[in-house]
């Protein structure tokens, strides 16, 4: 008799793929306009990335550092009108993209929650949640919560409002903290909160250290759903050496939890890609016209257009990973087991019941390595085969689809491999 299938876990929409942050409409659109109407025209691009949610804004009225000039219920006219926003929501819904609205109050100013602990603003966030929930948004983000007095109790209250409206609504909190204890204390009182932090950017970017960070986090959070990013805002390139970008994309998409990216991460956009642009709002490089300052020769492979035409590009890798992440059960909600690893690399298995299993091997080192993967510390349900098929490599030139011997895996410097193998009863 065949073994009984495991019950599928309840999956919310944010469990099924990546979230994509557009914190600056002008930077993202890159055409000087930067408004909600213009954003609508880029929804097809977001669909092509297979992201499940768009974390938008903030777009509310905020006079720098002025509480009285801040209105969480009003859209800054520079970004458009409530009608434009309603139209964006409608179009996004048709493309199955959820909209998460950033309500960080003083986003133009020095301190996101104003210079003193302004309780009146935090109190009014709850009215704003109700207002925008009624308007049809799918969730909210608030950043820099370490600057908010009584953050845990406010988050619990906001979570109640969000969940009270619908279990299908998401609350994301962001913190600059990389301290696990601080992160856990924020998560403790807030079930279902998605927390973005600087936890992973606290790494020395070795395989051993990254493995230790990831496993500590997963052990400490237990069966809570995680999110993975290197910061609460900002680009991967601001935190990572360039040669590790592909490796981190692979890791963020294959760890158990929701990967959260910022616009431009998919093409390796750098904060200062365009001279004279502020670091916080890099201009998205759609095509060569996005940067009049850089020679066309070097620029094509940095743009969305150029990378879309190149199957070996970072963008193509992102799309492939996003596609796998959103359709494979083992990656959607599978169990995670780290394998014993050396200082240069980190490897783990994702598996769910009788579905196809995935093995991720990441070489963080500057030198190639031969890795003999041992299954000594794996439970019986996650045993390793002798060979696994190569689904993709972060480096071009590999013969994808071919079986690789796990006892004698060879990896290039900074190479990551995603391998698959079937369940065997």
């Amino acid at each position: 008799r065949a073994p009984r299938c495991r019950d599928l876990p309840v999956q919310k929409w944010w469990h099924t793929g990546a979230l994509y942050r557009i914190g600056d409409l002008q930077g993202f659109q890159g055409n000087g306009a930067g408004n909600l109407a213009g954003l609508k025209g880029h929804l097809d691009y977001l669909s092509s990335l297979k992201v499940k949610g768009l974390v938008l804004g903030p777009i509310h009225k905020n006079q720098k550092d002025d509480v009285a000039g801040t209105d969480l219920l009003q859209i800054d006219p520079n970004f458009g009108s409530k009608e434009d926003f309603a139209s964006l929501l409608q179009s996004a819904k048709k493309k199955s993209i959820r909209i998460i609205l950033d309500l960080t109050p003083n986003y133009q100013g020095e301190n996101s929650w104003f210079s003193t602990q302004v309780d009146t603003v935090a109190t009014k966030v709850k009215d704003a949640l109700e207002f925008w929930l009624q308007a049809g948004v799918d969730g909210f983000q608030v950043r820099d919560i370490e600057n908010l007095k009584d953050a845990s109790s406010f988050l619990a209250e906001w979570q109640n409002i969000t969940k009270g409206f619908s279990e299908d609504r998401l609350l994301i909190a962001g913190t600059n903290s990389s301290d696990l204890q601080q992160i856990l204390s924020l998560l403790e009182s807030n079930k279902d909160l998605l927390l973005t932090s600087s936890y992973l950017s606290n790494s020395s970017f070795t395989g051993e250290h990254t493995k230790s960070l990831v496993t500590q986090y997963l052990n400490a959070t237990g069966n809570r759903w995680c999110s993975w990013s290197l910061s609460q805002a900002g680009l991967l390139t601001s935190f990572l050496p360039a040669q590790l970008l592909r490796l981190y994309q692979l890791m963020l998409f294959t760890l158990p939890g929701t990967p959260v990216f910022s616009y431009g991460d998919e093409i390796g956009l750098e904060a200062a890609a365009v001279p004279g642009q502020p670091v916080e709002a890099p201009v998205m490089l759609w095509d060569e016209s996005s940067f009049p300052f850089i020679s066309a020769a070097g620029s094509a492979n940095m743009t969305v257009k150029g990378q879309s035409e190149d199957p070996g590009s970072l963008l193509s890798l992102f799309r492939r990973l996003s596609d796998q992440r959103s359709k494979e059960r083992s990656l959607l909600h599978g169990d995670f087991h780290a394998l014993s690893s050396g200082p240069g690399f980190f490897s783990y298995i994702r598996h769910w019941d009788q579905n196809e299993r995935f093995l991720v091997v990441l070489n963080f080192g500057d030198v190639g390595l031969s890795a003999g993967l041992q299954a000594s510390d794996l439970p019986a349900s996650a045993s390793l085969p002798a060979k696994a098929d190569l689904l993709l490599s972060t480096q071009p030139g590999r013969d994808e689809g071919s079986p690789l011997e796990l006892e004698r895996l060879k990896l290039e410097p900074h190479e990551g491999l995603l391998l698959r193998f079937p369940y065997v009863a």
Epitope: D65, D66, V67, A68, G69, D71, L73, Q74, F114, S115, T116, Q117, V118, D119, T120, T123, K124, K126, D127, E130, F131, Q134
Partner: antibody, heavy 115, light 107 residues
Framework: QVQLQESGPGLVKPSETLSLTCTVS????????WSWIRQPPGKGLEWIGY???????NYNPSLKSRVTISVDTSKNQFSLKLSSVTAADTAVYYC?????????WGQGTLVTVSS | DIVMTQSQKFMSTSVGDRVSVTCKAS??????VAWYQKKPGQPPKALIY???YRYSGVPDRFTGSGSGTDFTLTISNVQSEDLAEYFC?????????FGSGTKLEIK
């Protein structure tokens, strides 16, 4: 230009409920905060509470057990009910729009609590 | 609750003079303070918000200053129509609270 006008009885008996209505004209009651404030004779101003068009309210803890503020968006009105009144509730009652501070006020209406 | 103290109940001044009305908060309220002018039989009128920003239509002889716990409303070149009571209000924390008021008398 937003204008506010309070209406309601000027005399209420002790232990009864004081009821006032504020009509907003020249603008929509939606997506703003609407407050009640009072000033007893010879004293300072006291904030009673606000309502937001979703029906969300925030009351002064000193009055919370006796206060109800409600909104009728179809009539562009919001109302105050203050129960179990005593002579200490005698005051000029103002309705106002709150943007953290109060930028538009009604003329105010004097309510006397007396038997 | 945050207590806003206006220690001077009355202030006497002459037309053309400069006068300063003060207000002290019982705890740090940043710049989250507004000032109002109230004349008998009329509702209060907003003069200043965020401690120093003049509300639209308010003459520039009214200026606000201060942050933290100490705030000042200054009227330079006092006019006879400035005869009124002046209130401060904090909006840093709920409940919103007002000062007890300072009455300006013209000599």
């Amino acid at each position: 230009q937003v204008q506010l006008q309070e209406s309601g009885p000027g005399l209420v008996k002790p232990s009864e409920t004081l009821s006032l209505t504020c009509t907003v004209s020249g603008g929509s009651i939606s997506s703003s905060y609407w407050s009640w404030i009072r000033q007893p004779p010879g004293k300072g101003l006291e904030w009673i509470g606000y309502i937001y068009n979703s029906g969300s309210t925030n009351y002064n803890p000193s009055l919370k057990s006796r206060v109800t503020i409600s909104v009728d968006t179809s009539k562009n009105q919001f109302s105050l009910k203050l129960s179990s009144v005593t002579a200490a509730d005698t005051a000029v009652y103002y309705c106002a729009r709150e943007t953290y501070y109060f930028d538009y006020w009604g003329q105010g209406t004097l309510v006397t609590v007396s038997s | 609750d945050i207590v806003m103290t206006q220690s001077q109940k009355f202030m006497s001044t002459s037309v053309g003079d400069r006068v300063s009305v003060t207000c002290k908060a019982s705890q740090n309220v940043g710049i989250n303070v507004a000032w109002y002018q109230k004349k008998p039989g009329q509702p209060p009128k907003a003069l200043i918000y965020s401690a120093a920003y003049r509300y639209s239509g308010v003459p520039d002889r009214f200026t606000g200053s201060g942050s933290g716990t100490d705030f000042t409303l200054t009227i330079s070149n006092v006019q006879s129509e400035d005869l009124a009571e002046y209130f401060c209000q904090q909006y840093n924390s709920y409940p919103l609270t007002f000062g007890s008021g300072t009455k300006l008398e013209i000599k």
